[in-house]
Amino acid sequence: QLPPGKPEIFKCRSPNKETFTCWWRPGTDGGLPTNYSLTYHREGETLMHECPDYITGGPNSCHFGKQYTSMWRTYIMMVNATNQMGSSFSDELYVDVTYIVQPDPPLELAVEVKQPEDRKPYLWIKWSPPTLIDLKTGWFTLLYEIRLKPEKAAEWEIHFAGQQTEFKILSLHPGQKYLVQVRCKPDHGYWSAWSPATFIQIPSDFTMND
């Protein structure tokens, strides 16, 4: 019996600068069925457009496919909540696709214990960038972070790998089973989720001595 409360656009993310999705939180429903619509215009334009795809991103979302995504324009968007008693509006959100990229986690994480005869043994970690990211165009610089810990330990040990897709770790506890994960982020944007954990058993004769 009341108009809807204020919705809030709380997150916009792009996996690769080619598409993006925004999500909103509904306000109170006022006790009545409420319809939501997202409208937007591009900076410098006055023509308002409605969300092209309410389905792909799940409930309370708007997905912008390739044909609706342009990298060099700021989107100004707002959610309208309407029930039989009235309409309410979110604050306007300004979105620049360049700054909302959150890639998928890196792929093909491989971990191996290397024990060269003439040098210290080490843990060799290798991975591939996420498939949706095209690094060849030069649009993207991906940075990587690795975390690992003994299976029963509480604390993670974190290593920054920069732009490389392989990394060596020297100091490990012999005889322990380690979990290893990797994640990535673009130069502007958000860290991906951590990749699924890969387990590696460190041999008992793995030595950290010179």
């Epitope: 009341l2 409360g5 039989q84 309409s87 309410s88 509006f89």
Partner: antibody, heavy 119, light 110 residues
């Protein structure tokens, strides 16, 4: 006949508290949103707060947010306004008004006779 | 400073037609319905028009309401002395998330 009767007004010191009540009769109380509207002496109307029929949804004017709490007891057909941290600018006649039902945006109708709060 | 803007006063002679305006914005009048209230001296307000142009039962058809864009108006035809009162427009504001009133218009029947 639909009736609303406010009570609980009076004189209170700044920083003090007061609880207003509004007894409703002549309609199915739980099917309507309810409102408090106030009018400072010689001034216009100012909406204060609203509550949905089930008491789940509540709204407040920015001027009272965090200080006033609206509630209702549908078993007693009564609307309440708990007013804390009262200020001189809260001095007004406080009206309770019936809002909309489940199907139509009806406006505030009827209004109670009002109760005077002096801070 | 009220969110909805009304002229502070209006006047007319008996039998005349008087119009009171109410100006708002896209988040109130522009996207929601307008209600009008009459407050006779020393009494509680009374609903005069709801949903832009609907009259509750008991309100004479001399009173009519309309809305266009972000403005609304109340027209009173065949003005009578008992119409002397304060008139308020009001409605839901979807940005402020609350109901807003105009400052009120004092109608004097000359």
């Amino acid at each position: 006949e639909v009736q609303l009767l406010e009570s609980g007004g009076g004189l209170v010191q700044p920083g003090g508290s007061l609880r207003l009540s509004c007894a409703a009769s002549g309609f199915t109380f739980s099917s309507y949103g309810m409102h408090w509207v106030r009018q400072a002496p010689g001034k216009g109307l100012e909406w204060v707060s609203a509550i949905g029929g089930r008491g789940v949804s509540t709204y407040y004017a920015d001027s009272v947010k965090g200080r006033f709490t609206i509630s209702r007891d549908n078993s007693k057909n009564t609307l309440y306004l708990q007013m804390n941290s009262l200020r001189a600018e809260d001095t007004a006649v406080y009206y309770c008004a019936r809002g909309s039902n489940w199907t139509h945006a009806l406006g505030f109708d009827p209004w109670g006779q009002g109760t005077l709060v002096t801070v | 400073q009220s969110v909805l803007t009304q002229p502070p006063s209006a006047s007319g002679t008996p039998g005349q037609r008087v119009t009171i305006s109410c100006s708002g914005s896209s988040s109130n009048i522009g996207s929601n319905t307008v209600n009008w209230y009459q407050q006779l001296p020393g009494t509680a307000p009374k609903l005069l028009i709801y949903g832009n142009s609907n009259r509750p039962s008991g309100v004479p058809d001399r009173f009519s309401g309309s809305k266009s864009g972000t403005s609304a108006s109340l027209a009173i035809s065949g003005l009578r002395s008992e119409d002397e009162a304060d008139y308020y427009c009001a409605g839901w504001d979807g940005r402020l998330i609350g109901w807003v009133f105009g400052g009120g218009t004092k109608l004097t029947v000359l």
